[in-house]
């Protein structure tokens, strides 16, 4: 009983439940392969509880192990289109601070039009995650086709 | 020590750990694109702890942010088969109440025979999730090839 | 306040937050389809908190429902290569104890070069998970392309 009451009084943040789910805002300018994300209840079903957006890139606020997941669907795409525009690749990584830069997750589309994956990875406060899409096909902005999120799992 | 004791005395449900993993029961009749799911220890490794099944569709019992995941494999399928049939698409969405109807996750098979993805999304008590499979290829009922689940992540 | 202090004093293990993320070490000898995994901070971003490795296979230390996830990318692969070497299949299952042997997750590559999926499944202390790759194409050892992990979700 005491625990239940205490739990209700504590802010969720103290439990470390940082979580975010983002939708695609736009692609970068010509030489910038990054996808730019947005989130918040006004936009639909995307949200940020803990992490923040910094110029469309996701910045982590709490150290810990995170589940990172992503799905990207190419717009106006068929298996023929995809194979003719090969290679299209998506990479998720820590892009800043530069000292921690690393690729966490990488997938190629080959003859498919959607990639989806997830992984566990340690992230630190201040890490900014970037999602780089290389290739000549545009990603879909439909919120059920392209999304990116993180979930804090444990310290 | 006191916390550990209190935690042990509390039912898991009060911690909000709602979770379900379902296996395919059957497809719908001709005009019904929905997949019908089943779960429970008697069926193998599927289970429902919190959410319930309502005529083969998953109904949420606790408000919160959920990780929704799905894998669907088409039966007797090859890349040739997949390309020779009408585009097969899977969509996961809230189908009731009607006021909250929305597509959460959508994937096309293109020349592949399996789709798998996951996302974080807010769900409310009473939301029913439907998984719509459009196309003319049957989904596999093998429990390691086709499954659908949700995991409560935070309030 | 009391709750927060108690929580900090408890070892994480008592909360049941077992988690592991592994990277590919090597493939098995000729008649052994298993992938052999490795993990630990010295290797990069892989880790084991609770589960252990037993001759390259992941052994569970705590009963519960786990989220199991995997991504495997085939090395030096294109959709042409993949279709010419078909079928290449990945299966994740409990391989010991023999009495609990079962396939949990199965995917074929078809014309793709990467598979990625995840599922919830009950696992018991002592369960060893094996990942069997059948086919004639080598998996990539790049840590952002091939990885395997589990996350304890609830009892």
């Amino acid at each position: 009983q005491r625990f239940a009451q205490a739990q209700q009084q504590l802010p969720l943040e103290s439990l470390g439940w940082d979580v975010a789910e983002l939708q695609l805002n736009h692609t970068g300018p010509q030489q910038d392969p990054r996808l730019y994300w947005q989130g918040g209840p006004a936009l639909g079903r995307s949200f940020l509880h803990g992490p923040e957006l910094d110029k469309g890139q996701l910045r982590i606020h709490r150290d810990g192990i995170y589940m990172v997941h992503i799905q990207v669907t190419l717009a106006i795409c068929s298996s023929t289109t995809a194979s003719r525009h090969h290679p299209t690749t998506l990479a998720v990584g820590i892009c800043s601070p530069a000292s921690r830069s690393i690729s966490l997750l990488r997938l190629s589309f080959h003859q498919g039009c959607t990639i989806a994956s997830q992984r566990l990875t340690p992230l630190a406060r201040g890490d900014t995650l970037c999602t780089n899409l290389t290739g000549t096909l545009l990603p879909s902005r439909n919120t059920d086709e392209t999304f990116f999120g993180v979930q804090w799992v444990r310290p | 020590q006191r916390f550990a004791q209190a935690q042990q005395q509390l039912p898991l449900e009060s911690l909000g750990w709602d979770v379900a993993e379902l296996q395919l029961n059957h497809t719908g009749p001709q005009q019904d694109p929905r997949l019908y799911w089943q779960g429970g220890p008697a069926l193998g490794r599927s289970f429902l702890h919190g959410p319930e099944l309502d005529k083969g569709q998953l109904r949420i019992h606790r408000d919160g942010i959920y990780m929704v995941h799905i894998q669907v494999t088409l039966a007797i399928c090859s890349s040739t088969t997949a390309s020779r049939h009408h585009p097969t698409t899977l969509a996961v969405g809230i189908c009731s109440p009607a006021s909250r109807s929305i597509s959460l996750l959508r994937l096309s098979f293109h020349q592949g025979c399996t789709i798998a993805s996951q996302r974080l999304t807010p769900l409310a008590r009473g939301d029913t999730l439907c998984t719509n499979l459009t196309g003319t290829l049957l989904p596999s009922r093998n429990t390691d090839e086709t499954f659908f689940g949700v995991q409560w992540v935070r309030p | 306040q009391r709750f927060a202090q108690a929580q900090q004093q408890l070892p994480l293990e008592s909360l049941g937050w077992d988690v592991a993320e592994l990277q590919l070490n090597h493939t098995g000898p000729q008649q052994d389809p298993r992938l052999y995994w490795q993990g630990g901070p010295a290797l990069g971003r892989s880790f084991l908190h609770g589960p252990e490795l037993d001759k390259g296979q992941l052994r569970i230390h705590r009963d519960g429902i786990y989220m199991v996830h995997i991504q495997v990318t085939l090395a030096i692969c294109s959709s042409t290569t993949a279709s010419r070497h078909h079928p290449t299949t990945l299966a994740v299952g409990i391989c010991s104890p023999a009495s609990r042997s079962i396939s949990l997750l199965r995917l074929s590559f078809h014309q793709g070069c990467t598979i990625a999926s995840q599922r919830l499944t009950p696992l018991a202390r002592g369960d060893t998970l094996c990942t069997n790759l059948t086919g004639t194409l080598l998996p990539s050892r790049n840590t952002d392309e091939t990885f395997f992990g589990v996350q304890w979700v609830r009892p």
Epitope: - | L24, T27, P29, Q30, T73, A75, I76, S83, R84, H85, H86, P87, T136, L137, L138, S140, R141, N142, E145 | -
Partner: antibody
């Protein structure tokens, strides 16, 4: 209501070709594969092949591979089955058929077209 | 190719009695949680009519006196209480792989 209406009976000489049509209505033509099945007089049923009207891809029974061609015209929702180098044993009723939800079994059939091969 | 063998070739049953037709595949037609076996009824001068799909599913509009069972290589079509309008030839068909093949047919008559 799904309907499959086939062209009329044909009489052909050995070595000639025949082209049978099947006009589909009552559903989205490009969605469902259309199969061809034949039945010789007093005999059983034999699957010849199928075509996906969405892109025109066809798959043929190896037995007929060198002699059969299946095509479609999406503007008229019609599929065609052409069989060449006809011989007397090709005398049969030729049916087109499609399915109601999933491919593999045939819920809707044409009325059949009798092709007689005789010198 | 998978060879489908039907038995018997013909069957005479009294009105109201049970009729049973068997179909054997040369190798298993069951996979992915389904048995890819289907049954048709054909009357003279008509195209076949789907009765049962995936071994045991009754097609919409088909009387429930028709039922199907079996898995792997052995399948059965049962007419629980034969009616006059059930006089016809019955065919089994598999769709496990290409080419699809049919059984040779069983002629059902009234005794």
């Amino acid at each position: 209501e799904v309907q499959m209406v086939q062209s009329g009976a044909e009489v052909k000489k050995p070595g000639a070709s025949v082209k049978v049509s099947c006009k589909a209505s009552g559903y989205t033509f490009t969605t469902y594969n259309i199969h061809w099945v034949r039945q010789a007089p007093g005999q059983g049923l034999e699957w010849m092949g199928d075509i996906y009207p969405g892109n025109g891809d066809a798959s043929y029974n190896q037995k007929f591979r060198d002699r059969v061609t299946m095509t479609r015209d999406t503007s008229t929702s019609t599929v065609y089955m052409e069989l060449s180098s006809l011989r007397s044993e090709d005398t049969a009723v030729y049916y087109c058929a499609t399915f109601s939800r999933f491919d593999g079994w045939f819920a809707y059939w044409g009325q059949g077209t009798l092709v007689t091969v005789s010198s | 190719d998978i060879v489908m063998s039907q038995s018997p070739d013909s069957l005479a049953v009294s009105l109201g009695e049970r009729a049973t037709i068997n179909c054997r595949a040369s190798r298993s037609v069951s996979t992915s949680g389904y048995s890819y076996m289907h049954w048709y009824q054909q009357k003279p001068g008509q195209p076949p009519k789907l009765l049962i799909y995936l071994a045991s599913n009754l097609e919409s509009g088909v009387p429930d006196r028709f039922s199907g069972s079996g898995s792997g290589t052995n399948f059965t079509l049962t007419i629980s209480s034969l009616q006059a309008e059930d006089v016809a030839v019955y065919y089994c068909q598999h769709s496990r792989e290409l080419p699809y093949t049919f059984g040779g047919g069983t002629k059902v008559e009234i005794k």
